[in-house]
Interface confidence: medium
């Protein structure tokens, strides 16, 4: 199954790493330290 | 307002069957995995099912394998609990809840919303 | 399957007391991202259950600060600085590292 980081979601994630949790069909954002938010795009 | 509303309990006699829906609200239900889980007259909680974004995957604990099957469609923001050949322990108040948000770095962390219950009864 | 065991399962509290509840897991609960998925659950007389502590320490949103989890592997604890009337009610341990996702018995906190 394709990963939807490579794809749909590949610049979703503004300050962060786009994880995908393939048992739950979930995408989330691995934020880098002081960001924070569905994106990482708060500070 | 984000909302879980469960419908479909009954009395049920031993051996047969219900169907349990779940109807979601206020936020973008194909984002989040969803889940089931119960609580027997004056017992704790116990989970009883969950289910994948899209549907593809499915989870149950022992106690339910094989009886209980858990659907959603994303089109009708709706969640199912199929149960058959039910038995007198199945007896619960049964919610349904929402496993999020997944897309925080927290994305696991547990089930932030739940809907009132819907009561099972089996009894002959 | 993990068996998570609380205790007290009774917890009879003075207004304004600080108090405490154990939670411990039968194996470690951190998964191979090194992450801990280790939560509290508060359930109201009469109402459902809801999210109280996420990931053995993080407050969900609107829940005071006089809560506030700790632990780790398999020792956990719950911590309510100064009880209120309104925290009255059934508090839950859950799991969700392992599958099935297990719940503690529970511990009933009422006032003295």
């Known amino acids: 199954k394709k990963n939807p980081c490579n794809a749909k979601f590949q610049n979703f994630c503004i300050h962060g790493e786009c994880k995908y949790i393939e048992h739950l069909e979930a995408v989330t954002c691995k934020c880098q330290q002081e960001y924070f938010g569905e994106r990482c795009g708060e500070k | 307002e984000v909302q879980l509303v469960e419908s479909g309990g009954g009395l049920v006699k031993p051996g047969g069957s219900l169907r349990l829906s779940c109807a979601a609200s206020?936020?973008?239900?194909?984002?989040?995995?969803m889940s089931w889980v119960r609580q027997a007259p004056e017992k704790g909680l116990e989970w009883v099912s969950t289910i994948s974004t899209g549907g593809t995957y499915t989870y149950y604990p022992d106690s339910v394998k094989g009886r209980f099957t858990i659907s959603r469609d994303n089109a009708k923001n709706s969640l199912y609990l199929q149960m058959n050949s039910l038995r007198a322990e199945d007896t619960a108040v049964y919610y349904c809840a929402r496993q999020g948000p997944i897309y925080y770095g927290n994305y696991y962390y547990g089930m932030d919303v739940w809907g009132q219950g819907t009561t099972v009864t089996v009894s002959s | 399957d993990v068996v998570m065991t609380q205790s007290p399962l009774s917890l009879p509290v003075t207004l304004g007391d600080p108090a405490s509840i154990s939670c411990r897991s039968s194996?470690?609960?951190?998964?191979?991202?090194?992450?801990?998925?280790l939560h509290w659950y508060q359930q109201r007389p009469g109402q459902s259950p809801k999210l109280l502590i996420y990931k053995v320490s993080n407050r969900f949103d609107g829940v005071p600060d006089r809560f506030s989890g700790s632990g780790s592997g398999t020792d956990f604890t719950l911590k309510i600085s100064r009880v209120e009337a309104e925290d009255v009610g059934v508090y839950y341990c859950s799991q969700s590292t392992h599958v099935p996702y297990t719940f503690g018995q529970g511990t009933k906190l009422e006032i003295k």
């Open positions: 206020g936020f973008t239900f194909s984002s989040y995995p």
């Open positions: 194996q470690s609960l951190v998964n191979q991202e090194g992450e801990t998925y």
